[in-house]
């Protein structure tokens, strides 16, 4: 169809902020549960600890986590699970100071990836009971369909 | 021409991951050689240690390098070389802990720049023999034509 | 109207670099004054310490500040002020080493936000007399209209 000026600009976007973060007793990871703060388009669906891709395509993904933890290195892994396999897309790693008053770092990373319909995207911190700051301007996750 | 819904969305994109990293003996730098992991469009061409711009325009560029080095500050410089001159576009700098077990940091930066046809984009670490982690989800480089 | 190939690609963009940074005597903040380095479109206007949104919509915002400061944690807050209220959009936080020779870190963050006509966007470092490096490739601010 012929595009109007308005249609032309409508990249689907989703910016998510945390609801909470939990650790499973039997695994050395902390997962974040997300809720939408900004949404345009219908191709992405927040689903508990993940985001479901309903509209396949190339996306800019970004992730930030704010850590308050003296564990020597902290960081997050952004992965997609779909078609029976899991794939790490990108990760962020930050060395942390050993003094609790100084142990305060945000870790941001982003990249462009092809996501498939049905993929579930998740942010995992590979530490049990990681000390995170769940402020919406410190920890967030986002998608832009390109 | 009238744009179809599909044409409308086709930003050229290129996401690159490392092949290897090398240092020149006569210069205090480490350079990364890149290969495409995701490519859409023909305006960008990986060329050894650089990326050649074939389609001039405004691009979002992003770069991440994962450092495993106790040198007190590490980081990368993203530059363009073209029309007989070199220009630094942006850089990322990270102070590193002095203990090898803690010296693990990713450094991410990005920005929007006008690139000219024939420009060569490169990522340089201003340290010879810098200790990098060349995992494709830790060290990468990307372009989105806006 | 029917879009031409050229029209299709014209995201408004603005990439800004510092003019200077100042602290008000009566407040514990450092503010950066910005000037455009790259501009496409008319929807954004640099205005001293802020950027005025003239064209409402969804924007990718990014911010980097290069810190040279031994204060235990440094970082920047990106906020919008409009319609009588102020809102923090995102922030970046970096723990800093206590030794001046090592105290060198860039802090990058970004996200997608809906901005309203008349909003003023600003970058604030919540420290008086923060030691910043104002190199245009170390400290910058950018917008892409999506």
């Amino acid at each position: 169809a012929v595009l109007t000026q308005k249609q032309k600009k409508q990249h689907s976007v989703l910016h998510l902020v945390p609801i909470n973060a939990t650790s499973k007793d039997d695994s050395d990871v902390t997962e974040v549960m997300w809720q939408p703060a900004l949404r345009r388009g219908r191709g992405l669906q927040a689903q508990g600890y993940g985001v479901r891709i309903q509209d396949a395509g190339v996306y800019l993904l970004y992730s930030q986590v704010l850590f308050q933890d003296v564990t020597f290195t902290m960081g997050q892994v952004v992965s997609r699970e779909g078609q029976g396999r899991q794939e790490t897309l990108f990760r962020c790693i930050r060395s942390m100071p050993s003094h609790p008053d100084r142990a305060y770092n945000s870790c941001y990373s982003a990249g462009v990836f092809h996501l498939h319909q049905g993929d579930i995207l998740s942010v995992i911190i590979p530490r049990a009971r990681a000390k995170l700051n769940l402020s919406p301007h410190g920890t967030f996750l986002g998608f832009v369909k390109l | 021409a009238v744009l179809t819904q599909k044409q409308k969305k086709q930003h050229s994109v290129l996401h690159l991951v490392p092949i290897n990293a090398t240092s020149k003996d006569d210069s205090d730098v480490t350079e990364v050689m890149w290969q495409p992991a995701l490519r859409r469009g023909r305006g960008l061409q990986a060329q050894g240690y650089g990326v050649r711009i074939q389609d001039a325009g405004v691009y979002l560029l992003y770069s991440q390098v994962l450092f495993q080095d106790v040198t007190f500050t590490m980081g990368q410089v993203v530059s363009r070389e073209g029309q007989g001159r070199q220009e630094t576009l942006f850089r990322c700098i990270r102070s590193m802990p002095s203990h090898p077990d803690r010296a693990y940091n990713s450094c991410y930066s990005a920005g929007v720049f006008h690139l000219h046809q024939g420009d060569i984009l490169s990522v340089i670490i201003p340290r010879a023999r810098a200790k990098l982690n060349l995992s494709p989800h830790g060290t990468f480089l990307g372009f989105v034509k806006l | 109207a029917v879009l031409t190939q050229k029209q299709k690609k014209q995201h408004s963009v603005l990439h800004l670099v510092p003019i200077n940074a100042t602290s008000k005597d009566d407040s514990d903040v450092t503010e950066v004054m910005w000037q455009p380095a790259l501009r496409r479109g008319r929807g954004l206007q640099a205005q001293g310490y802020g950027v005025r949104i003239q064209d409402a919509g969804v924007y990718l915002l990014y911010s980097q500040v290069l810190f040279q400061d031994v204060t235990f944690t440094m970082g920047q807050v990106v906020s919008r002020e409009g319609q009588g209220r102020q809102e923090t959009l995102f922030r970046c936080i970096r723990s800093m080493p206590s030794h001046p020779d090592r105290a060198y870190n860039s802090c990058y963050s970004a996200g997608v936000f809906h901005l309203h006509q008349g909003d003023i966007l600003s970058v604030i470092i919540p420290r008086a007399r923060a030691k910043l490096n104002l190199s245009p490739h170390g400290t910058f601010l950018g917008f892409v209209k999506l």
Epitope: - | S23, D25, D26, S27, D28, T71, F72, T73, M74, G75, T88, I93, P126, R127, A128, R129 | V17, P18, Q68, D101, Y104, K131, L132, N133, L134, S135, P136, G138, T139
Partner: antibody, heavy 121, light 107 residues
Framework: QVQLVQSGAEVKKPGASVKVSCKAS????????MHWVRQAPGQGLEWMGY????????KYNEKFKGKATMTSDTSASTAYMELSSLRSDDTAVYYC??????????????WGQGTTVTVSS | DIVMTQSPSTLSASVGDRVTITCKAS??????VAWYQQKPGKAPKLLIS???NRDSGVPSRFSGSGSGTEFTLTISSLQPDDFATYFC?????????FGQGTKLEIK
């Protein structure tokens, strides 16, 4: 306290080579780069490049590539600069100066006393 | 290469005067500018780094300002020991470059 002590004055014939040394003390030698700066008689200052003792890697001003060779000996906390194929216009005072290890964005905070190199037939 | 243009090249002043030396960069160098003082037969001495940060031990009468392309060194009240040559330097981009110098002499 930080000190940079350079070798003494040299008089050389055109075509010869000369090696200037700069011995550092009072700090961790491998944590800082050593810059070399030239000052011709009655002229300004010209940055020639640096040697990074951490990895013994040099960074040259393009103008001095092929003319200057910068090295370091960490066991002796000493930086060296060798000038080859000397010409009369290489007559100058050569200074070493300390800079922080991430060479960009740091000024040169301590300087050697300078070594005068005179090239004359 | 970035050109650093200093002015004036020579400045005559008296003890107690306030003097200003300016330096213009041919492109934006942020605040990555240093000022050095050099006396005849001696090595340069760092006065100011990051455009405005006085080095340790430098008297408070010396101050620096500016960012981007325009920088100034100000001596608020000249002392006899201040008559020397002053150089600006940018360290934002390789190769590092210096201004041509300003000779401050007694009037």
């Amino acid at each position: 306290q930080v000190q940079l002590v350079q070798s003494g004055a040299e008089v050389k014939k055109p075509g010869a080579s000369v090696k200037v040394s700069c011995k550092a003390s009072g700090y961790t030698f491998t944590s800082y780069v050593m810059h070399w700066v030239r000052q011709a008689p009655g002229q300004g200052l010209e940055w020639m490049g640096y040697i990074n003792p951490y990895n013994d890697a040099p960074k040259y001003n393009e103008k001095f590539k092929g003319k200057a060779t910068m090295t370091s000996d960490t066991s002796a906390s000493t930086a060296y600069m060798e000038l080859s194929s000397l010409r009369s216009d290489d007559t100058a005072v050569y200074y070493c100066a300390r800079g922080l290890g991430y060479a960009l964005y740091y000024a040169m905070d301590y300087w050697g006393q300078g070594t005068t190199v005179t090239v004359s037939s | 290469d970035i050109v650093m243009t200093q002015s004036p090249s020579t400045l005559s002043a008296s003890v107690g005067d306030r003097v200003t030396i300016t330096c213009k960069a041919s492109q934006n160098v942020g605040n990555n500018v240093a000022w050095y003082q050099q006396k005849p037969g001696k090595a340069p001495k760092l006065l100011i780094s990051s455009a405005s940060n006085r080095d340790s031990g430098v008297p408070s009468r010396f101050s620096g300002s500016g960012s981007g392309t325009e920088f100034t060194l100000t001596i608020s009240s000249l002392q006899p020991d201040d008559f020397a040559t002053y150089f600006c330097q940018q360290y934002n981009i390789y190769p590092f470059t210096f201004g041509q110098g300003t000779k401050l002499e007694i009037k």
